[in-house]
């Protein structure tokens, strides 16, 4: 007969490691006992457990509560054991010695490798502002054993750079994502993707980009000057801009205070029934924490009576 085991067994930190040891013998052969030992325990082997066909499992004091048999059904030729809650100190070699009847003793070794999955963290860079050059958007760090892989998933155009630092059997990896901020990036997701054999699936951490900007201001409402005549009701000017953070609006009149009855409602300037006194230069001032913009328009309220008078004068003059 012969022993079937694995050269290498890999387990994730905190999970249970199955240490395989199966005797494939001829019919009629029996396994009397299986002894498991840590084979690289410095001064000689350190016993883990003894699996006896008659008396069951005996676990050595050093591994009390940590070694079990796999759940039933059990094959009498299977000497595999479970090492519960694997820690990094469990990495190393293990030996199973199988006593059979009538074939005698067999032994096999395996190597246990413990994977330490990463706990990634994402750190946003400094505040992003439109007009900046290449700027750090975020950095992502993950440490594990073996080294994790750190990549970025995003629609945003940018460049990545990574650095890693190795310690014994583990590595810390940091990847940075740099970009040239533009308003189109605002609200876009930037996702750090960490891969590691100790993870069931890639770990993803998403950061939403916030790019400070302020668009040029413009004023709407004067498209048809003929509508701005004495007596007209509901006339209004609307200031158009956009920004991040959302901007605030302020209206002033360049050639004096706002006329009485004119209402300021955020980005909108509402007029009472128009009079010629509403003529003037109006300024919309848009600002956020990033910048400020101005747009000014000239309102010229037409007086039909005055116009007709002018026309008569013109006629008589000719």
């Amino acid at each position: 007969g012969e022993l079937e085991t694995s050269d290498v067994v890999t387990v994730v930190l905190g999970q249970d490691a199955k240490l395989p040891c199966f005797y494939r013998g001829d019919s009629g052969e029996q396994v009397g006992q299986v002894a498991w030992a840590r084979a690289d325990a410095g001064e000689g082997a350190q016993e883990l457990a003894l699996l006896h066909s008659k008396y069951g499992l005996h676990v050595s004091p050093a591994y009390e509560g940590r070694v079990e048999q796999p759940p039933p059904p059990r094959n009498p030729l299977d000497g595999s054991v479970l090492l519960r809650n694997a820690v990094q100190a469990d990495e190393g070699e293990y030996e199973c010695r199988v006593s059979t009847f009538p074939a005698g003793s067999f032994q096999a070794r395996l190597r246990l490798r413990v994977l330490v999955p990463p706990l990634p963290s994402l750190n946003p860079g400094p505040a992003l502002e439109e007009g900046q050059g290449l700027t750090l958007a975020a950095s992502c760090t993950a440490e594990g054993s073996p080294a994790p892989s750190v990549t970025w998933d995003t629609e945003v155009k940018g460049t990545t750079s990574s650095r890693s630092f190795k310690h014994s059997r583990s590595a810390a990896v940091t990847s940075e994502f740099h970009l040239v901020p533009s308003r189109s990036m605002n609200g876009q997701p930037l996702t750090c993707v960490v891969s590691h054999p100790g993870l069931l699936q890639d770990q993803r951490i998403t950061h939403i980009l916030h790019v400070s900007f302020l668009a040029e201001a413009s004023v709407r409402g004067l498209e048809d000057q003929n509508l701005w005549h004495v007596g007209r009701e509901g006339a209004m000017l609307k200031c158009l801009s956009e920004g991040q953070p959302p901007p605030s609006y302020n209206w002033t009149r360049l050639d004096g205070p706002l006329p009485s009855g004119v209402r300021v409602d955020g980005d909108t300037l509402g007029f009472p029934p128009l009079t010629t006194e509403h003529s003037g230069i109006y300024v919309c001032h848009v600002s956020n924490e990033f910048s400020s913009r101005d747009s000014q328009v000239t309102v010229d309220v037409l007086d039909p009576q005055e116009d007709s008078g002018k026309q008569v004068d013109l006629v008589s003059a000719s």
Partner: antibody, heavy 116, light 108 residues
Framework: QVQLVQSGAQVKKPGASVKVSCKAS????????IHWVRQAPGQGLEWMGW????????NYAQKFQGRVTMTRDTSISTAYMELSRLRSDDTAVYFC?????????WGQGTLVTVSS | EIVLTQSPGTLSLSPGERATLSCRTS???????LAWYQQKPGQAPRLLIY???NRATDIPDRFSGSGSGTDFTLTINRLEPEDFAVYYC?????????FGQGTRLEIK
């Protein structure tokens, strides 16, 4: 700094054995597995197996099982690879390498020539 | 065993150009278990990249690695004269450990 220094070139006759040494310095010898890799002239790299310097435990590639023996002497931080029943196609440079998952440090290599 | 296939076998480029070397694996390999080595004539291999994308100590940032699953790439930007050598990929996740057959990067 970490160093792996290997023994010098050897010429052997077919059927003989060769033993190559690899002396480690600059780190704790028993803390890292040592692997052996060989490279025939003009060919690629071929993994032969590893030894755990702490326990002396070994694992050999199937191709070399029964012909290769890896040992160590922790008192002088040295690993050994012995290959027996040499054939002409065993002519190669033999490297030792330290394992930190990947092979982060390598010996300079030992040329073994098998010729009658 | 996992077979690693590198392409092209030989790559002829001039200094200053960009080199792209491919390594395909016969089975999926966790990126944490893939490394790239550089070997110059008469020298031992030198670790360049581990964990598919992490530069080893003292490796210039013109070397970068990427990929996952069965497709991995080593990129060398702005080739320097000292970069002309043979490059090997390696998987160390399952036994036996295996290497690709190598890509020779030569001066055009």
């Amino acid at each position: 700094q970490v160093q792996l220094v290997q023994s010098g070139a050897q010429v052997k006759k077919p059927g003989a054995s060769v033993k190559v040494s690899c002396k480690a310095s600059g780190y704790t010898f028993t803390g890292y597995y040592i692997h052996w890799v060989r490279q025939a002239p003009g060919q690629g790299l071929e993994w032969m197996g590893w030894i755990n310097p702490n326990s002396g435990g070994t694992n050999y590639a199937q191709k070399f099982q029964g012909r290769v023996t890896m040992t160590r002497d922790t008192s002088i931080s040295t690993a050994y690879m012995e290959l027996s029943r040499l054939r002409s196609d065993d002519t190669a440079v033999y490297f030792c390498a330290r394992e930190d998952w990947d092979f982060d440090y390598w010996g300079q290599g030992t040329l073994v020539t098998v010729s009658s | 065993e996992i077979v690693l296939t590198q392409s092209p076998g030989t790559l002829s480029l001039s200094p200053g150009e960009r080199a792209t070397l491919s390594c395909r694996t016969s089975q999926s390999v966790s990126s944490s278990y893939l490394a790239w080595y550089q070997q110059k004539p008469g020298q031992a291999p030198r670790l360049l990249i581990y964990g598919a994308s992490n530069r080893a100590t003292d490796i210039p940032d013109r070397f970068s690695g990427s990929g996952s699953g069965t497709d991995f790439t080593l990129t060398i930007n702005r080739l320097e004269p000292e970069d002309f050598a043979v490059y090997y990929c390696q998987q160390y996740g399952s036994s036996p450990i295996t290497f690709g057959q190598g890509t020779r990067l030569e001066i055009k």
